[in-house]
Each structure stands twice: as C-alpha cells, then as structure tokens.
C-alpha cells in the first residue's frame, strides 16, 4: 500500500506477488535517498490505475523487472 508523504518512504506494505507486465501501466523504481533508505518499486496497473508496492527482494519481482527492462530495450531504437 503506497502512502503519500514528503519526507518518508512511500510504501507501508509490500507485495511478493508477481504482476503481469501486460497489465502494467507504469513501473516506478525509486532509489534509496536521504528521505527513504530503501529502494521502492511502485506498480500502477492499467485497471482503475490501481497501485501496488512491490518487494524488491522477491524473486518474482526481480523476474518482473528483468521482463520489463527486456521489453523496454526492444522498444528503444
């Protein structure tokens, strides 16, 4: 569950559940910073624009990131 705060981490809970890359509208990867000491991954789904915080340590999520970056490299000229 994401939560909007300025000087805090965004994610309150995280999911290990894999996400179908085709159902993704957007995938945000927020690097660790002075505001939040951990990497955060926020998936926005096409359906209703629903968001989900993903666990960067989860194997399923790591595979998702690989699949998405593969897809992006295909699209880039």
């Amino acid at each position: 569950v994401p939560l909007s705060r300025t000087v805090r981490c965004t994610c309150i809970s995280i999911s290990n559940q894999p996400v179908n890359p085709r159902s993704l509208e957007k995938l945000e990867i927020i690097p660790a910073s002075q505001f939040c000491p951990r990497v955060e991954i926020i998936a926005t789904m096409k359906k209703k624009g629903e968001k989900r915080c993903l666990n960067p340590e989860s194997k399923a999520i790591k595979n998702l990131l690989k699949a998405v970056s593969k897809e992006m490299s295909k699209r880039s000229p």
Partner: antibody
C-alpha cells in the same frame, strides 16, 4: 491460519504506562504495515497508529501523539504499542489490524480479538 | 483532517428488506481509499468493502459499495439475520489520520 492475538491489557492508574503486544501468524508479517485501532466502551472505532512493514514509517492520531509509540519486531512476528502518561479517555478495547499489501488500499483485512485497557484510579 | 459522517445513526429494518447506508466526507476522498466494516457486539470489526466498491474475500454479493468524491453508499440488498450489526466507513487518504465514521446501527424492526 492468518491470526493476530493481542495481549498486555489491564487496569492501570492515570499517568502510568502499559505495553500492548500483538502476535501475528499465518502470513508474511514482515511485508505488512500494521495498525492499532481502539474502541472506547459503547463508542465507535478510532484509529490510533500505523507502522510500515520495516518500521521506518510511523504515524499517530493527534490524541496519542507524544504519549504512545508503535514498534515491531519482525524476527518475532510481533507488533507493540507502548502507552505512556495514560489518561481516563484512553480506556478502550485495543485491536491490532493488518494493512493488506496486495493492492492500493484493501483496508484492514485481519483483526485481532482485542485487549482491554482500563485507566482508573 | 477528513471528517466522515454516517447516516442514519440507526436503521430499523426487517429481514429480507434492503438497507442503504450513507457515508459523507468533509472533503473529497479518492474512491481507492474508502472502506466499509461490519462489527457485531463483542467481536472485532470485519472488512466488507475496499476501494469503495470491491468486496473483500468471502463477503456475500448481497453487500455492495458505491460512490465517489464525498458521497459513498453501502447497500445490503436483502438483509439476513446475521447482517444486523454496526457498520463503519473509513477513509485512508494520502496521509493519516485514517478516520472512521461514527457508525450506523442496523437493527431488527
């Protein structure tokens, strides 16, 4: 099965302290934000505090800010609420509840049975 | 701080009847952040509806939620004996506090 069990309630004098615990089982506790919610006798529900899955984020209701501290020990699958400077108006049933992570906001989907705190001289 | 108002305070109905419960917010709430709970005497609350209109796991389809902005509704299409309880709405906005409404009691006429 998925379960939350609160403990630590009791009768305490005004100005004293009490620590509540909430033992979680049946799910990946370390992935879930956790809440404390209370209910005074014959009254409605009042959100008290929230802690993020890794303890970085903490949020409090104005009525308890500066007096209550929420914390967690993921190695023990346990949530805590340290309550200091207790007042008569803190008398309530205290529930811990899970913040469900598999969506944007799926509400508090698992609740404990509650533990009763009575502040009285 | 967003304040939630629920109406009516008490709803007296008979089994089989339709119940319509209202929850009004003092300022706009994203529908993603509105939930409904049921509470029976001596029990913990139970999540019924999240995201204003999605039923939680195991909740019968006689329960439905709707609304957006500042006005939200919980509808119980046909009241069963086990549905007589207190119902709370709750908002989970972009920052705490995550306020609950004062509740609507549905009792047997």
């Amino acid at each position: 099965q998925v379960q939350l069990v609160e403990s630590g309630g009791g009768v305490v004098q005004p100005g004293r302290s009490l620590r509540l615990s909430c033992a979680a089982s049946g799910f990946t506790f370390s992935n879930c934000g956790m809440h404390w919610v209370r209910q005074a006798p014959g009254k409605g529900l009042e959100w008290v505090a929230l802690i993020g899955f890794d303890g970085i984020n903490e949020y409090y209701a104005d009525s308890v800010k500066g007096r209550f501290t929420i914390s967690r020990d993921n190695s023990k699958n346990t949530l805590y609420l340290q309550m200091n400077s207790l007042r008569a108006e803190d008398t309530a049933v205290y529930y811990c509840a899970r913040d469900w992570p598999e969506g944007y906001y799926n509400g508090m989907d698992v609740w404990g049975q509650g533990t009763t705190v009575t502040v009285s001289s | 701080e967003i304040v939630l108002t629920q109406s009516p305070g008490t709803l007296s109905l008979s089994p089989g009847e339709r119940a319509t419960l209202s929850c009004r917010a003092s300022q706009s709430v994203s529908s993603s952040y509105l939930a409904w709970y049921q509470q029976k005497p001596g029990q913990a609350p139970r999540l019924l509806i999240y995201g204003a209109s999605s039923r939680a796991t195991g909740i019968p389809d006689r329960f439905s939620g709707s609304g957006s902005g500042t006005d939200f509704t919980l509808t119980i299409s046909r009241l069963e004996p086990e549905d007589f309880a207190v119902y709370y709405c709750q908002q989970y906005g972009s920052s705490p506090p995550f306020t609950f409404g004062p509740g609507t009691k549905v009792d047997i006429k």
